[in-house]
Structure formats: structure tokens, C-alpha cells
């Protein structure tokens, strides 16, 4: 049996029992790999004399797709596995009606976790076996009996990598904005020493509590639009690879020379971090290589110091700070937490204290985007090929899937009342929740116009009663007349216009006796032809950037860089007097018609470009014959 | 009425990187999701990349999915889109797009809005 670990206690904590709000009463029906633990799930709970409603969502970024866990199998031999498929259990999200809230929990055996309301930071466990229903500890971090831990990373280690510290360079931002640069992602791959796996008992817990521990510190750091995935676990269950000692210093040059050994054959990663159940001399918790990150030196080591794993997760969140540049917020003038000063302190405080941070310094932010300048932190730019665990759609990512209604973002950032964004289903009530014939969720009345006529080749739209999409756009009949030239497909191509449009507003048709002949390769004039639907010529304008011309006389045509293809005059351009370059050849208009479509609409409509009837308004295809309401009464009217 | 501006298109050796960005103009920006799009030679428009009006959702689709990072600056006014370790079927005239958050559902015809388009050339 494994030695019990020698947890810290509660102080103060409340009991709650948590209750799980019923999810979307459509059920999809998903294939039975998912597993147990939902995409989304909510949960009420009552404390502090508040009732909180947790809104999570499961963290599906949490492990990249190349993902693996090494341990030493019963025959003494090094095991490296790639779990496949694995349904998982650990969640984030926010609490609702809390703007700046967060949150970051398991619901593998009960919920544990944090969730965070303005400088509050509430941590939850289970206090039995009892699931996620059963009896919960909600208690402050500050109410955990611990002693305080500090970094053992000093100020002197610090100066030279960071340079001078001022004021100055620290403007505050408002707390609520991400910084406008793109997601940047660290690939972490985490070492658990012998005595952590002692401490825990098994590779299970072992794997279970790390999870949860990166959970925590991708959360932390989602503030500073970066993410953390875990691409590798290493288990040392059955004895150290290398000395794990309790001067924190010392241990993290034996696990960066380590790492250098194993670098070719394990993951590529950006940062490595030790978690030991080795208690560190003193009150340091941990030690990290400053600015390191990226390089061969990226890493840290942490002593799981505390009963709940956000504990170690603040620990490690702050020696990956000093990875990524941060200095100690202490030791920069007039640096500021955001934070109440009876919550505690930043991230990047020198010690713990109390109570567990919850957020970075304005000048941890700073410290960030200065290190993002290095040409060193290139590896934080490639997303690593995330894994999607579960499989399918993925509700609240801005993309309509499989099963869905509707996805306007997850509950915090959807605007859209129509749609249930927990559920990407219709709100209840509503007809539909998208589209230019949807109004206040329900569906526009037949008639109605949505798109209005842009130009003279095109045809006006009306919504049809029983969709909220617009019908597609049609245009006029190919072959109307329009200024210059006849409607093909919505536009009007004249040669006039296609030189404007390559050569700008000064650009026009070249002479007619420059189409009289095609063009070889090499700018060279040969067979004569008899029309104007061979290569473009023009002349005027400004020669188009990029772009090689081949000149013949006063005749500009313009021709690929190799000199092979010339641009031609384009489909539909009109050639003479109801006649347009079809084919490559200057035809008759009536290649456009196989028949008189307009007689067919019945006095409602007229043809369009797909020779079919484009009805009135009120009027129903495909031949105009009856109005909209007399189908939608015999069909029934739901949209 | 919002009007979208792309820019950053040019041409580039597979593998390399460009970003694009796309300024708009004409309306509150942070109410408006973004989407970048494409369309190569000869291929069907396809989506690329989407993010809501705050910036705290982004997702870019299946086929650029670690390569292309799309982000957004509103005191600027400006989407951007981040292409590395491009390839020559990444060749395509990318255009931003705009759809209003009030209204959006996730589909493609939420996207009103449309720019004229960058030209994006990868060689091999």
C-alpha cells in the first residue's frame, strides 16, 4: 500500500452539493467512444451565501495529437505509449453572470478544481466518494493550513537576464484585454519524480493529477492569449532517472542535463517542468532557468507542495513565467496587481503567501511581450496539432457542424438570442437563428424582399415565407442587354471593361485590327482570325503590377512570366451586334437560349441566368404559377 | 454598411510565412465575427479561419489547423491572419469577411460583409 500523503489541512470550508443542470433535452446521438463526460456540462452551487452556475466546457486542447506517457513496465523496461482515443474529464469555463470569471475543473470522481469571481478565488473536492453529487469542501486558498512557498529563483540570477527594471516600460492595460497578438502555444512535456509517484500510489492518480495540474496552468495563462498543452507524460514509477535533490538548484541542472540526453529520442517540445514529491530545502517550492524557454535550457522544477493541485499549478504557472522572461513583481517599480490586496498577490510574487494567485502583473505582461520581440521564442508560434479527443462536432468554435442548428460561440461570447449556445441548438421558441429572412427568430413572411438589385443584370430576391436563408442569388437572363454589352452570369463584359479592369481607369480596347490576329509564344503575331474573342489587347492605362506585356504595335496584351499564355477576352464579352464570344468564337446571342424559358413563368417572373423562372414577389417556382401561401397552406407552413 | 480591406497577399517559398491582415470600417468592429476564406485556382471557396468579435474564440479549420493563427486588434480595427510553414496548395486569392454577432449561427451565409481579396502565391 502506498504511503498516505501528508496533506495539508482546511481551516475553514463550506459543504455544498452540487447539482448538475440537465443537458439539452435533444439529445444527439454520438457514437459510443465518446465516453462518459459530456462536451459542455453546468453546475449550480451554493456557497458564500451565493448560488454559483458553473458553465464548463470540456478542455479538448488540453493534450496535443502526439500526445504519450512513458513509464517502466513490471519487467524493468522503459514503456512510451500513445493513448488513443481517450475520453477525459477535465473542464474550463467561466461562472455566469461574472464577466472576469473563470474556472478549471475535474469532474473525473467529484469536482475539483478552482473557479474564480472578481479577486475571489474559490477552490472545490470532494469530501467523500459520494460523485459529483455528493458532499464538496468550497473553501478559499487562503483557509489551506500551509506554510508559505517562495521561488528559489534570486534576484541576482535575474538582473542580468532581464536588464534594467523601471517603471517606466510598465503601462497599465485595462484588465479585461487580451493582448492583440496571436495565440501562442508552449508544448510541455512534464517529468513526475518517484517520490510524487510514491506519494500518489499509482500511474492512474499520477496521470489524473498532472491533467488536472496543466488544466490549471493553461487557464492561468489563457489571459496572456497562450495556451499549454501537454505532449508528453513521464512517470518514473519505478526509480529516479537522475537525482532528485532537495536543493531545488541543483535538481534543475540534473533534469536540464538530463532532458539535453533525452532530447533526440522523446518529444520535441518548448518546455520541460519537474513535479517532485521531493520536499526542497527551506520554504522554496520551486526553481526555474529565466528566459529560457525555447532553448535547450526550457525548464523548471516544482515541489507538489499543497493538498489541491492548483497549488502546484500557481508553482509551476510562475517558474514558467521566469521561463518566458518574468521577473519577481517585487523587485519592479511600480509594478501592479490587479488583484485586492487581502486576495493575495500576482503570479509572479516571490512567495506564494496565503492564498493562491490567480493572474498575471501588468508587468509580467510586459516582461511577456518583451520576450516575444526575441527571435528565441519562434517555437511559442506554431499551434501544435491539437488533439481532439472526442471526435465530431465541437460546440461554441463559430462553425455550424454536424447536429447543430446553430453555433454562435460558447455562452461567454455569443450574442446571438436565437441560438442556445450550450447546446448549439435553437433557443427555445425560436424558428431559426441566422439568415437575411430571419427576424427576431422567426421567419419572414413570403414576399419580403432580402437582397435588392445590385446592378441592371441582376434580379431582386424575396424571402419565400418558409426559410431564413435568402434564396440564392440569380441574375438576369444571359443575353439581356446591359450598358455596352449583354448580362452573362451577373456581369456585364465588354472589352472596354476588361481593359479597365487590368490596365485601370486610363485602360481601353485596343484597335480592332490588333484582335485580328492570335499571338504566339515569345510576343510572336501569326495565323489571322477572324473576330475578337482570341487574346485580350489594349491599350492605355497603367501596365498591371506583376504582370509581363507583350506589345505588337500599339497592342498591349498581357502574357504569363514564361511568355506561354496570353489573357484572352473573356467568356460572354460582346463581339458585334447581338453576338458574344462563346467558346472561344464570336457567336450568335441564341447560344445562350434552348428555348423561350420566359413563356414558361406565367406572367409572375422571368428568366434567369440558369435558365429557370425567378418569380415575383409572393409568387412560388418553379413556373410561377401559384402563390406562396396557396403551397405553404397544403404543405403546412413550419419552416 | 462595413467595408473590409485585406492586405499582406504576395508571394512566397513553401514553407515561409506571411500575415495578412484585414481592416475594417463603417461600424462597431468588436459586434462583427470575422472570417478569413479562400479560393485557389480552379476550387471551391472554403473557410480558413473564424473569430468572435472579442477575440476569445478563434478556430481555424481542419486543413490549416496549426499552421494559420488567426487574432484580432479592435482599438485597430483589424483582423490578421497568421500563415506559416506555408504550402503550394495554400495558393488562393484570401479574402476577411464579416458577419454580425447578433445575427451569427456559424454558417457561411452570415458573412455579409465581404473585402476584394488578397492574392497568395506559394512555389515549391
Known amino acids: 500500500i502506498a504511503p498516505s500523503r501528508p496533506w495539508a489541512l482546511m481551516e475553514q470550508y463550506e459543504v455544498v452539493l452540487p447539482w448538475r443542470l440537465p443537458g439539452p433535452r435533444v439529445r444527439r446521438a454520438l457514437p459510443s467512444h465518446l465516453g462518459l463526460h459530456p462536451e459542455r456540462v453546468s453546475y449550480v452551487l451554493g456557497a458564500t451565501g451565493h448560488n454559483f452556475t458553473l458553465h464548463l466546457r470540456k478542455n479538448r486542447d488540453l493534450l496535443g495529437s502526439g500526445y504519450t506517457e512513458t513509464y517502466t513496465a513490471a519487467n524493468g523496461s522503459e514503456v512510451t505509449e500513445q493513448p488513443r482515443g481517450q475520453d477525459h474529464c477535465f473542464y474550463q469555463g467561466h461562472v455566469e453572470g461574472y464577466p472576469d470569471s473563470a474556472a478549471s475543473l475535474s469532474t473525473c470522481a467529484g469536482l475539483r478544481g478552482f473557479f474564480q469571481v472578481g479577486s475571489d478565488l474559490h477552490l472545490i473536492e470532494p469530501l467523500d466518494e459520494g460523485g459529483e453529487g455528493g458532499r464538496h469542501a468550497v473553501y478559499q486558498a487562503e483557509h489551506l493550513l500551509q506554510t508559505a512557498g517562495t521561488c528559489g529563483v534570486s534576484d541576482d540570477s535575474l538582473g542580468s537576464l532581464l536588464g534594467p527594471r523601471t517603471a517606466a516600460v510598465f503601462r497599465p492595460r485595462p484588465g479585461d484585454s487580451l493582448p492583440s497578438r496571436e495565440t501562442r502555444y508552449v508544448e510541455l512535456y512534464v517529468v513526475v519524480d518517484n517520490a510524487e509517484f510514491q506519494m500518489l500510489g499509482s500511474e492512474a492518480a499520477v496521470r489524473h493529477r498532472v491533467l488536472e495540474v496543466v488544466n490549471h496552468v493553461d487557464k492561468l495563462y489563457q489571459k496572456l492569449n497562450f495556451r499549454v498543452v501537454l505532449v508528453g507524460l513521464e512517470i518514473w514509477n519505478s526509480q529516479d532517472r537522475f537525482h532528485v535533490s532537495p536543493d531545488p538548484s541543483v535538481t534543475l541542472e540534473n533534469l536540464l542535463t538530463w532532458q539535453a540526453r533525452q532530447r533526440t529520442r522523446r518529444h520535441l517540445h518548448d518546455n520541460v517542468q519537474l513535479i517532485t514529491g521531493v520536499d526542497f530545502t527551506g520554504t522554496t517550492v520551486g526553481f526555474a532557468r529565466v528566459s529560457a524557454m525555447c532553448s535547450h535550457s526550457s525548464g523548471a522544477v516544482n515541489q507538489d507542495h499543497s493538498k489541491n493541485p492548483v497549488g502546484v499549478a500557481c508553482t509551476m504557472a510562475h517558474e514558467m513565467g521566469h521561463n518566458l522572461g518574468m521577473d519577481h513583481d517585487e523587485n519592479v517599480q511600480g509594478c501592479r496587481c490587479q488583484e485586492r490586496f487581502e486576495a493575495g498577490r500576482c503570479i509572479m510574487a516571490g512567495s506564494i503567501g496565503s492564498s493562491f494567485p490567480r493572474m498575471f502583473s501588468d508587468c509580467s505582461q510586459a516582461y511577456l511581450e518583451s520576450f516575444l520581440e526575441r527571435p528565441q521564442s519562434v517555437c511559442l508560434a506554431n499551434a501544435p496539432d491539437l488533439s481532439h479527443l472526442v471526435g465530431g462536432p465541437v460546440c461554441g468554435n463559430l462553425f455550424v457542424e454536424r447536429g447543430e442548428q446553430c453555433d454562435c460561440g460558447p455562452p461567454e461570447d455569443c450574442r446571438n438570442r436565437c441560438c442556445n449556445s450550450t447546446t448549439c441548438q435553437l433557443a427555445e421558441g425560436a424558428q431559426c437563428a441566422h439568415g437575411t429572412c430571419c427576424q427576431e427568430c422567426k421567419v419572414k413572411p413570403a414576399g419580403e424582399l432580402c437582397r435588392p438589385k445590385k446592378d441592371m443584370c441582376d434580379l431582386e430576391e424575396f424571402c419565400d415565407g418558409r426559410h431564413p436563408e435568402c434564396p440564392e442569388d440569380a441574375f438576369q437572363e444571359n443575353g439581356t442587354p446591359c450598358s455596352g454589352g449583354y448580362c452573362y452570369n451577373g456581369a456585364c463584359p465588354t472589352l472596354a471593361q476588361q481593359c479597365q479592369a487590368f490596365w485601370g481607369p486610363g485602360g481601353q480596347a485596343a484597335e480592332e485590327s490588333c484582335f485580328s490576329y492570335d499571338i504566339l509564344p515569345g510576343c510572336k503575331a501569326s495565323r489571322y482570325r477572324a473576330d475578337m474573342c482570341g487574346v485580350l489587347q489594349c491599350k492605355g492605362g497603367q501596365q498591371p503590377l506583376g504582370r509581363a506585356i507583350c506589345i505588337v504595335d500599339v497592342c498591349h496584351a498581357l502574357t504569363t512570366e514564361d511568355g506561354t499564355a496570353y489573357e484572352p477576352v473573356p467568356e460572354g464579352t460582346r463581339c458585334g451586334p447581338e453576338k458574344v464570344c462563346w467558346k472561344g468564337r464570336c457567336q450568335d446571342l441564341h447560344v445562350y437560349r434552348s428555348s423561350n424559358c420566359s413563356a414558361q413563368c406565367h406572367n409572375h417572373g422571368v428568366c434567369n441566368h440558369k435558365q429557370e423562372c425567378h418569380c415575383h414577389a409572393g409568387w412560388a417556382p418553379p413556373h410561377c404559377a401559384k402563390l406562396l401561401t396557396e403551397v405553404h397552406a397544403a404543405s403546412g407552413s413550419l419552416p | 454598411e462595413v467595408q473590409l480591406v485585406e492586405s499582406g497577399g504576395g508571394r512566397v517559398q513553401a514553407g515561409g510565412s506571411l500575415r495578412l491582415s484585414c481592416e475594417a470600417s463603417?461600424?462597431?468592429?468588436?459586434?462583427?465575427?470575422i472570417g478569413w476564406f479562400r479560393q485557389g485556382p480552379g476550387k471551391e471557396r472554403e473557410s480558413v479561419a473564424r473569430?468572435?468579435?472579442?477575440?476569445?474564440?478563434?478556430t481555424t479549420t481542419e486543413t490549416v489547423k496549426g499552421r494559420f493563427t488567426i487574432s484580432r486588434d479592435n482599438a485597430k480595427n483589424t483582423v490578421y491572419l497568421q500563415m506559416n510553414s506555408l504550402k503550394p496548395e495554400d495558393t488562393a486569392v484570401y479574402y476577411c469577411a464579416a458577419a454580425y454577432s447578433g445575427h451569427f449561427s456559424g454558417r457561411v451565409s452570415d458573412f455579409l460583409y465581404w473585402g476584394q481579396g488578397t492574392q497568395v502565391t506559394v512555389s515549391s
Open positions: 473569430i468572435s468579435g472579442s477575440g476569445l474564440t478563434n
Open positions: 463603417g461600424r462597431t468592429f468588436s459586434d462583427y465575427i
